[in-house]
Interface confidence: low
């Protein structure tokens, strides 16, 4: 009498999540009596997927008539398949008894579940940084399986090489998440520049994901502060202009102080945009020399986006001079034309 | 190229601290890990923690967790590891040593140490 | 944890020999073996990582092999400046952990 074998043909069968996979199982003799089952997984704590007798299994068929008298094939389709699916499936051949007895397994059959990788998430820092600063950006994708996946990081077109990426997890696992951290060095001219993070799976046939952030949301450029005069008018008010340059975001407060009180205060909004994404706002101020007897001190003092204020000052020279020549009003800016560096990086 | 640089001895009294330093250079100290490894005279080798200086997330071997702190000093390139209440059990050699796995933020892969420090050889005594 | 067995503490070997040194895991660590060299003077070197990748700079006389919990490093024409403790190290489960360590020496 020829011993009972439990044929699985294929070691592995792979299927994209959705479709339908078959698990192939053929035995060589019909005796002795009894049921086939199919198991997920071996030993004490196996699933059962399939019996040939009993029980309900509403994604799982026989792809023969295992109810035939001389059937020896015992293969099942499952529907649907999940990533949950992922496994080595055993067909295992029972001696009918009470309670039934095994007698002999297959070698298995794994089961791999090609499943495509979430679109992926990139986030940025929670705070803005200004240039030279760098600041790290995260890439997450989810769902994928197999492991093997390859992520890249872009700006503006330009591939980067300082990123650090890690799969989990380590072991085997239905599914895989992928998270990668790339550290960008910020420039002035980054307020239109996007970062890219392009993740390649076999399941997407070689038309990679990708997920983008805005380096807008990232960056602060502080401004440049120009305090100059315009000539004398007629009527002994000089028309002083504090120009504010080059900045971003546009969230602006300008105070004018003169010999160290408030004068006035604006809030900058609804500005043009300049072609690299940085905002410019003029303000001027009047000044009556006939009511002064003494130099007035101008302060423009400027707050950009809640950081510590920069101040520029200007002293407008009227001791020196008649009121009624007012045209040989001098001029001092006692500021600097150099950035404030007192912007905090968090 | 890589240098793990490390102060070679520290003599310190039981009941003490010393915290004791590692300075890298020749590579972007940000995004590689820095583990601690102690080895008493004549044994074997015992991980006791590492750190990732860019976010400043550790790991911690459970063995140390109330002996060691780890921390980073970002602007001179530099990790730190301080070893309290000191007994003649902490006698030995401490290593600091990069990670080479790609492993971030607490999700691991195979992980390897590719450059080691000198040791710094810690006597505990009165 | 994972525990790392180098159940050989000390080994003599003549120059020019092939030799051998086994490390074993608790549990399956999926080729993340580490093996290492320390020189007497207390200089670690890393040797072999992933089971039998070479370290850049290390000499192709050094090899690695193994899988699930049974891992060997191996030397095959023993050189004077092979004299020092090797380790093996598990890189799959924090904590990372070491074999006890094989001395090597020379007949």
């Known amino acids: 009498e020829e011993e009972l074998q439990v044929i699985q043909p294929e070691k592995s069968v792979s299927v994209a999540a959705g479709d339908s996979a078959t698990l192939n199982c053929t035995v060589t003799s019909l005796i002795p009596v009894g049921p086939i089952q199919w198991f997920r997984g071996a030993g004490p704590g196996r699933e059962l997927i399939y019996h040939q007798k009993e029980g309900h299994f509403p994604r799982v068929t026989s792809v023969s008539e295992s109810t035939k008298r001389n059937n020896m094939d015992f293969s099942i389709h499952i529907s649907n398949i999940t990533p949950a699916d992922a496994g080595t499936y055993y067909c295992v051949k029972f001696r009918k008894g009470s309670p039934d007895v095994e007698v002999k397994s297959g070698a298995g059959t794994e089961l791999s579940v090609r499943a495509k990788p979430s679109a992926p998430v990139v986030s940025g820092p929670a705070v803005r940084a200004t240039a030279e600063h760098t600041v790290s950006f995260t890439c997450e994708s989810h769902g994928f399986s197999p492991r093997d996946i390859t992520l890249k990081w872009f700006k503006n077109g330009n591939e980067l090489s300082d990123f650090q990426t890690n799969v989990d997890p380590a072991g085997k696992s239905v599914s895989y998440s992928i998270r990668s951290t790339a550290r960008v060095v910020l420039t002035r001219r980054d307020v239109h520049s996007q970062v890219i993070c392009e993740v390649a799976h076999v399941t997407l046939q070689g038309d990679p994901l990708r997920g983008t952030a805005n380096l807008s949301e990232a960056i602060r450029v502080p401004p440049f502060l120009e305090v100059t005069q315009q000539s004398m008018r007629a009527d002994n008010q000089v028309n002083v202009t504090c120009q504010v340059t080059k900045f971003y975001p546009q969230r602006l407060q300008l105070t004018w102080l003169e010999n160290g009180n408030v004068s006035r205060t604006e809030m900058a909004s609804a500005l043009p945009e300049n072609k690299d994404g940085t905002y410019n706002w003029t303000s001027w101020l009047l000044v009556n020399v006939s009511a002064h007897r003494d130099d007035v001190k101008l302060t423009c003092q400027v707050e950009h986006d809640g950081q510590p204020a920069v101040n520029k000052s200007f002293s407008v020279k009227v001791s020196a001079h008649p009121k009624e020549q007012g045209s040989n009003t001098a001029a001092e800016n006692t500021g600097t034309n150099e950035r404030n560096h007192h912007h905090h990086h968090h | 190229q890589v240098h793990l640089q490390q102060p070679g001895a520290e003599l310190v009294k039981p009941g003490a601290s010393v915290k004791l330093s590692c300075k890298a250079s020749?590579?972007?100290?940000?995004?590689?890990?820095i583990n601690w490894v102690k080895q008493r005279p004549g044994q074997g080798l015992e991980w006791i923690g590492n750190?990732?200086?860019?976010?400043?997330?550790?790991n911690y071997n459970e063995k140390f967790k109330t002996k060691a702190t780890l921390t980073v000093d970002k602007s001179s390139n530099t990790v730190y590891m301080q070893f309290s209440s000191l007994t003649s059990e902490d006698s030995a050699v401490y290593y600091c040593?990069?990670?080479?796995?790609?492993?971030?933020?607490?999700?691991?892969?195979?992980?390897?140490?590719?450059?080691w420090g000198q040791g710094t050889l810690v006597t505990v005594s009165a | 944890d994972i525990q790392m067995t180098q159940t050989t503490s000390s080994l003599s070997a003549s120059l020019g020999d092939r030799v051998t040194i086994s490390c074993r895991a608790s549990?399956?660590?999926?080729?993340?073996l580490n093996w290492y060299q320390q020189k007497p003077d207390g200089t670690v070197k890393l040797l072999i990582y992933?089971?039998?990748t070479l370290h850049s700079g290390v000499p192709s006389r050094f090899s690695g092999s193994g899988s699930g919990t049974d891992y060997s490093l191996t030397i095959s024409n023993l050189e004077q400046e092979d004299i020092a403790t090797y380790f093996c190290?598990?890189?799959?489960?924090?904590?990372?952990?070491f074999g006890g360590g094989t001395k090597l020496e020379i007949k």
């Open positions: 040593a990069r990670s080479e796995g790609t492993y971030y933020g607490g999700r691991y892969e195979g992980d390897w140490f590719g450059y």
């Open positions: 020749g590579y972007n100290f940000n995004i590689y890990w």
């Open positions: 750190i990732y200086p860019s976010s400043i997330s550790t």
């Open positions: 549990q399956d660590i999926r080729n993340y």
């Open positions: 992933f089971t039998s």
């Open positions: 190290q598990q890189g799959n489960t924090l904590p990372w952990t």
